[in-house]
Every structure is written in C-alpha cells, then in structure tokens.
Amino acid sequence: AAPCPDACCPHGSSGLRCTRDGALDSLHHLPGAENLTELYIENQQHLQHLELRDLRGLGELRNLTIVKSGLRFVAPDAFHFTPRLSRLNLSFNALESLSWKTVQGLSLQELVLSGNPLHCSCALRWLQRWEEEGLGGVPEQKLQCHGQGPLAHMPNASCGVPTLKVQVPNASVDVGDDVLLRCQVEGRGLEQAGWILTELEQSATVMKSGGLPSLGLTLANVTSDLNRKNVTCWAENDVGRAEVSVQVNVSFPASVQLHTAVEMHHWCIPFSVDGQPAPSLRWLFNGSVLNETSFIFTEFLEPAANETVRHGCLRLNQPTHVNNGNYTLLAANPFGQASASIMAAFMDNPFEFNPEDPIPVSFSPVDTNSTSGDPVEKKDETPFGVSVAVG
C-alpha cells in the first residue's frame, strides 16, 4: 500500500496513527472519530492541551497514546466523553501534574506517565496511591518527580481530602418545620463544595446559602417523607473528594393498617405500620394480649432503606379453630397511637366439637421480625376450607 501522506492515517480496522512531526495542535475533527477504538499520537510538539471538546465524539475509544509530544495540561474532564478508555499512555510529554478527576470514572487497566517532568505535590497523592496499590501498571514505571526524587518517596502526611462536619438539629423535628443544616469544610486547597439532594424530591422546599468553608441548607416545610432520605455534603480539593450524608428524623404519629389473612406456606395477617420514631407493636386476640410463640408471631419483611413504613405479617403456623377470632394490632410512639382490627376464620373445628370444652386463648407480646423455613413437606390431605371476614 502507498504511504499515507496525511497527518493521521488509518491503522487496522478502527485505529488511527498521527505521527507526522508537528502536524497537530488539537484533536478536533479527526477522521472517522466516532468508530475509533485506538488513537496513537507521536511527535506533536504543538499539541499542548487536552480538553473536553478534543475527545467529543470518541465514545468508542479504548486505547489512547500521546507520546513524545508537547502535552502540558490535561483538563480534569478531558475524558468525560470516552468512558470506555482502558489504556492511557501519556509518556514523554511536558506534564507536571494530572488531576485525580481526570481518571475518575474510568476503568484504566494501564496508565503510563514516565518521562514527564512531574512536580511532587499533594495533587499527585492519588498517583502515589496507585503506585502503592499496584494499579494501572504504575509501580513498574518507577515515576520520578523532576529534581525531587521518586514519587514513591513524596511526603504525604498533609495530603488529605477535605474534612466535613454536618450539623443537624438536636431537637425533634416535626412535620411543617424548617430545618437548617450546616456543612463545615476543613482542609487544604479547597476547590469546590456543595449539596447532593437527589433523594429529597417533594420532602421539603430547599434553599442553599453560604459557600466555602461553611455551607448552609434550609429545608423548609418538611414532610414525613424526609425520613430516611440522605442529604449529602461534598467537597473537593486537589487530593480528592469527600462526602458526608446525614438524615433528618421528622417525628410523626404511629399509624397502622391490617389486611385480610392470606394462606401461604403458613397463614399471614398482613400489616403495615408507620411512624417516627418507629412504633412499638402489640397484638390482641379477642381483646386479650396475644403472647407470641413459634406458632403465632410477628414477622417483618425487609425494610426499604429509604422509608419508615414497615410491612409484615402476624404469622400463624397451622392455625386451628381456636385461632379464629378478632385480631387487633396496636401501634404507639410518643406522638400518637393507632390500632386496626380484623376478623380471621381459619377453619372449623377439625377435632370434633364438644360445646362444653373450653376454648383456649393464647396470651402477652413483643415487636419482632424475619424470613421463612418450614420443613419441606408432602401433604396427604388438602387443608380445611377457610373463610375470612374483614372487621
């Protein structure tokens, strides 16, 4: 094949090589950019900056090599449009530093930076960590800082990410209140800070105030939905990023719902309880306190991480006619109490009924939780018919 006279020439089915001396000063408008998986650039002294716009449209890029060129600066967001990048070789350029943000979000198997006049500072603490942890092939490069010795020997005691403290109100927060949160940021070289409020949705009206080093956040007219929602303060410096999440507990009274009994492996009287703080529960059977046993007990489903409502069952293992009756669930917290009742009829007397026999009741309780484990069974007979009346 005839030699390629262009600044950049195809290499394989989805590669591009740009090696003609001084032909590039940016990477705009590379031919066939959208399908490129490999880009090799060499001897480009005028290519000094690599920025976000340079790699736009290179979404399939996996290998990027820029060597023996004039690269002095790589923007922190330079690789935003190349999320599949796995090999990055920037050796023998003029780089003094490279931000941790540049490689954040990439899954780099290889990062080559040898032959650059690196300047040892806290901004390279992340790279020193890669070297310590054996990541990206960095240890094999024995990276040096220009006139300062090995990167591995750089003192790092003062190189920490920002320290965050979020102050939340001590006092009880009620529905409708306004809540002021303050995030105190400490650390060297603070660059940016802010709040992440994606979970809040309709839980409150949000107003931000202040700036580094003290950020304020007012949550106005809070609702009970604010419970279990993360409010996150973040801050960044040249070493890295820190985040602290807090939750605001909004007090509200207990509430309870009961549903018709259902037969599964066992019988279940489904319930839902809500309230903040979490309510204590008690069951009554025909008006008397129900003592929980391995045959009748409260079982909670796994709670959703971001809500206060708890769902569960009063679980009955092989109930008989003596378990027919009125079940009441009482829920109480310091802000109120609630109850709900339901009639359950599991079966007629399977043992022959004598009107003079006493009907026993099981009595006294505790709030409980969990998931199944009956013996694997073979049934010779079908169960008795059941009827359930809603009270």
């Epitope: 045959f295 007990f297 293992n317 043992f351 099981s362 009595f363 013996p375 049934k379 007979e381």
Partner: antibody, heavy 115, light 108 residues
Framework: EVQLQESGPGLVKPSGTLSLTCAVS?????????WTWVRQPPGKGLEWIGE???????NYNPSLKSRVTISVDKSKNQFSLKLSSVTAADTAVYYC????????WGQGTLVTVSS | SSELTQDPAVSVALGQTVRITCQGD??????ASWYQQKPGQAPVLVIY???NRPSGIPDRFSGSSSGNTASLTITGAQAEDEADYYC???????????FGGGTKLTVL
C-alpha cells in the same frame, strides 16, 4: 441444609449453673424460625425447656421458668441455654432444635450434675 | 391439664398396620407432631400439623386426629420402624409445648 451443634461442659456441680450453646449452620438464626431446647433424662422421655426468636421473644416451660434463661447471639449465629440451681434431676441429654416443628435437631450433649 | 398420654409399649407384626395414640385436652385445640427416636440418636420429625410429612419420611407414616386423641399410623411396618415414638403439641394455653411420655414400638 440446616445443622445444629450443642456445646458446653458435660459435668456441672449441684447448685451450679448449666450453660450450653447451640451453633446454627447452613441457615441464619435470623430467619423466620424460632429455636428451642429439649432435654431427655437417661432412659426417660423428652421435655421441652423453652424457645426463642431472634428478636428476643422467648417462652419457657412453666415448671422450669424460674431457673431458665435462653438467649440469642445473632452475630455468632447461635443461641444459648442457662439453667441455674441444678440438681441431679437435671442430668439429661440436652438437644437444641428448630421450632415450631423440631424438624432439625442437634446430636445432643449429655450433661451430668454431680459433685 | 398440660399432659399428653401415650401407651408405653406397642408391638406389630412385620408388614402389618399399627396405630400409636396420644391423648390430652390440648389435642382438642391443636395438632400433634410425631417424632421417631432410635437408641443413641436424636429424634426425627415424622409427622407435623395436619398430617404433613417432611421430605424423606416414607408415606407409610400418616397422622390423624379426633376429639382429644391424635394418632400416628404406620401402614406396613418395617423392621427399621422399631423405635420410640413421641407426640407433642402446644399446651392448652398455647403458650408452651408439651411432649407425650413416648411409646416403644417393637416390630415382630
């Protein structure tokens, strides 16, 4: 499948406290099952001692209630039995099992009360 | 009363049917479970609830209940069925469990 294993001293002095532990493997003690202790004096029948749920609910045999404590340690996936003020009548093979059906049992451990 | 009563001993000819009974007031209210115990071994659950057999238990074992009596029936007894059999159920109060005194089954 679930397996249970009792452990503890085989000899306890009269008036002392019998302490046994049941390690649960092949399943979580925090499942929807209760866990129980049963004993069997030599040559005699089975006697239910008590049961516990991982959230702390417990029930005891009324005849032993004043002397029995059953507890659960979720972090170790085990539950325990303490029986105080023992006498020779408490000499028995002690079993742990899964309630309510007692569908899984430990192999049992003989505890002798003797000075 | 919080008692379950069993016959101390029962015998059956090989291949014949035998019924082991358990009596008590609690059985008017609750199902019995049945356990088989061979010398030096832990008991094994054979029937629970309303005639449920755990997996691995042969179908010659079955349970039934009437009035204050629960029964374990072995249809076509085998030599390996020779063992002690215990019933248990919830006590009448529902708050604790009780065992019968056990029945020694001999297969002739």
């Amino acid at each position: 499948e679930v397996q249970l294993q009792e452990s503890g001293p085989g000899l306890v002095k009269p008036s002392g406290t019998l302490s046994l532990t049941c390690a649960v493997s092949g399943g979580s003690i925090s499942s929807s099952n209760w866990w129980t202790w049963v004993r069997q004096p030599p040559g005699k029948g089975l006697e239910w001692i008590g049961e516990i749920y991982h959230r702390g609910n417990r029930n005891y045999n009324p005849s032993l209630k004043s002397r029995v404590t059953i507890s659960v340690d979720k972090s170790k996936n085990q539950f325990s039995l303490k029986l105080s003020s023992v006498t020779a009548a408490d000499t028995a093979v002690y079993y742990c099992a899964r309630a309510p059906w007692f569908d899984y049992w430990g192999q049992g451990t003989l505890v002798t009360v003797s000075s | 009363s919080s008692e379950l009563t069993q016959d101390p001993a029962v015998s059956v000819a090989l291949g014949q049917t035998v019924r082991i009974t358990c009596q008590g007031d609690a059985l008017r209210s609750y199902y019995a479970s049945w356990y088989q115990q061979k010398p030096g071994q832990a008991p094994v659950l054979v029937i629970y609830g309303k005639n449920n057999r755990p997996s691995g238990i042969p179908d010659r074992f079955s349970g039934s209940s009437s009035g204050n009596t629960a029964s374990l029936t072995i249809t076509g007894a085998q030599a390996e069925d020779e063992a002690d059999y215990y019933c248990n159920s919830q006590a009448s109060s529902g708050n604790h469990l009780i065992f019968g005194g056990g029945t020694k089954l001999t297969v002739l």
